[in-house]
Interface confidence: low
């Protein structure tokens, strides 16, 4: 029967991932041990790999929540073409049973005791509530259990008395003027202003609150035309030390605008703050290293065998780098300075060709010449060979990419009288003169 | 456009000895392999002498010890040196240059040069 085959397992939860299309046979799709497949949609998935028991299912459920229950898990045999240990056969579940307990009594309803007296009323003065109370103990609940109902209920209720009416402050009245001219006299230059507790007056009978705070209130005079005093520098501080461990830097002196500081509108002091100078330490910086680009990779070999050419057979290729220009202590090149590859050699393999869409035009050469033109190109491109794209070499290692290397020899068929490169070529058009930008702007 | 120019060519006795030079120019990019080829009259034209970017080399059984091939990667120049030639070392050599990568390759090839080699 055909099913639906994917290129992935999830073992973690037994799903099919990455589907790849139905109507094959489970052979063709096991033909890759990775893959899965599913008889109908949403059906169980199975692996292509040889059969074994998956992980064991949470545990379900206490079969109740309190007292002593049971509760199920199960496992799955999954895979293709065998069997799991104890001879039996995909699909086929195992089940466990084991005794659980959430909860070792299970709840009781407790009873209500009579209510309690009513609680005095919230308030003294109008209307307000009042609450009574009863307790969960007529008998106790058991377990976790509770008794049915409320704790406590509540009602209006009247004081019978009138409540009284407490004071507040009406809006400040107006400043009165300044006591001074301007600042710097003798006497601070201050203003006052008042206020009246009548908004409302507190109630005579019952006795209401008076107003919190002074009727009265006093501030510093803003605003008045201070007596201006001109900036005047501090001498300069101590020269700061070189701050950098090599070649040039900058030190730097600092005076201050306070003597005396300028107070009530006069001028800050004239000039600059600080004044800078250079500092020669004498002694080079540090260069770092940087890596060359990478060279050419080494011919693609295997140990003791004369050629993998045009085989599918792995070897190892290897290129090298240059930690150029470090002086001074710098720091040296981080990383290695070889990098080594699996690789098969299609060095000299006559290989199937097929020729390329075309390429997308080229610059157009030369820039600042006569007759520029661009061109695209068409090329014969080898069909490479469907060799593993991975290999594990050594036990344990696990698996390492495989990159083909070398030249081979790609064969299509004649292309406007080309074996491997046709080339459009069209001139460019309304071409501007090459000028230096920078001789342009003087 | 590529150009493959060759240069060096000539008349020689045999036992003498004579340097082929070549450069790939126009619109190339990384030059991966760059190679000697020669067609003697009436004959196939066969690979005399390959050498890739990195520096790896491959000569004919029939030139081994007597010619080596050597290259200047950065300026794309190929030098065929031939020591102690021999009269069926007589053909038109032609320079190859190979642009190549996964993705797909062009090869280009100059107009060749004669060498005759007389006893």
């Known amino acids: 029967d055909p099913v639906l085959c994917f290129t992935q397992y999830e073992e973690s939860s037994g799903k099919c991932k990455g589907l790849l299309g139905g109507g094959v046979s489970v052979e063709d799709c096991c033909l890759n041990t990775a893959f899965a497949y599913q008889k109908r949609s949403g059906g169980l998935c199975q692996p292509c790999r040889s059969p074994r028991w998956s992980l064991w299912s949470t545990w379900a459920p206490c079969s109740v929540t309190c007292s002593e229950g049971s509760q199920l898990r199960y496992r799955r045999c999954v895979g293709w073409n065998g069997q799991c240990s104890g001879k039996v056969a995909p699909g086929t579940l195992e089940w466990q049973l084991q005794a659980c307990e959430d909860q070792q009594c299970c709840p009781e309803m407790g009873g209500w005791s009579g209510w309690g007296p009513w609680e005095p009323c919230s308030v003294t003065c109008s209307k307000g509530t009042r609450t009574r109370r009863r307790a969960c103990n007529h008998p106790a609940p058991k377990c976790g259990g509770h008794c049915p109902g409320q704790a406590q209920e509540s009602e209006a209720c009247d004081t019978q008395q009138v409540c009284p009416t407490h004071g507040a402050w009406a809006t400040w009245g107006p400043w009165t003027p300044c006591s001074a001219s301007c600042h710097g006299g003798p006497h601070e230059p201050k203003e006052t202003r008042s206020r009246k507790c009548s908004a409302p007056e507190p109630s005579q009978k019952p006795p209401g609150k008076p107003c919190p705070g002074l009727a009265y209130e006093q501030r510093r005079c803003t605003g008045l035309p201070p007596c201006p005093v001109a900036g005047g520098w501090g001498p300069w501080g101590p020269v700061s030390p070189c701050p950098v461990t090599c070649g040039l830097g900058q030190t730097m002196e600092q005076r201050t605008c306070n003597h005396p500081v300028p107070q009530h509108g006069g001028p800050f002091c004239a000039g600059d703050a600080t004044r800078t100078h250079i500092c020669n330490t004498a002694v080079p910086c540090p260069v770092d290293g940087e890596w060359d680009s990478w060279g050419e990779w080494s011919p693609c070999i295997r140990r003791n065998m004369k050629s993998i050419s045009c085989q599918e057979i792995p070897g190892q290729q290897s290129r090298g780098r240059t930690c150029r220009g470090r002086k001074f202590d710098g720091h040296r090149c981080a990383g290695q300075q070889q990098d080594i590859r699996h690789c098969y050699s299609i060095q000299h393999c006559p290989l199937k060709g097929s020729w390329s869409e075309w390429s997308t035009w080229g610059l157009c050469m030369p820039p600042c010449g006569p007759n520029p033109t661009r061109a695209r190109q068409r090329l014969c491109t080898p069909l490479l060979p469907k060799y593993p794209p991975t290999v594990s070499m050594v036990e344990g290692q696990g698996e390492k990419n495989v990159t083909f290397w070398g030249r081979p020899l790609p064969r299509c068929e004649e292309l406007q009288g080309q074996k491997l490169v046709v080339e459009e070529k069209r001139p460019c058009l309304h071409v501007p003169a090459c000028k230096d930008p920078e001789e342009e702007e003087l | 456009q590529v150009q493959v120019v060759e240069s060096g060519g000539g008349l020689r006795q045999t036992g003498g000895s004579l340097r082929l030079s070549c450069t790939a120019s126009g619109r190339i990019f990384e030059v991966n392999m760059m190679a000697w080829y020669r067609q003697a009259p009436g004959k196939q034209r066969e690979l005399v002498a390959e050498?890739?970017?990195?520096?790896?080399?491959v000569y004919a059984d029939s030139v081994k010890g007597r010619f080596t091939i050597s290259r200047d990667s950065a300026k794309n120049t190929v030098t065929l040196q031939m020591n102690s030639l021999k009269s069926e070392d007589t053909a038109v050599y032609y320079c190859n240059a190979l642009q190549y990568d996964r993705y797909g390759g062009a090869e280009y090839w100059g107009q060749g040069t004669q060498v005759t080699v007389s006893s």
């Open positions: 050498i890739s970017r990195v520096g790896t080399t």
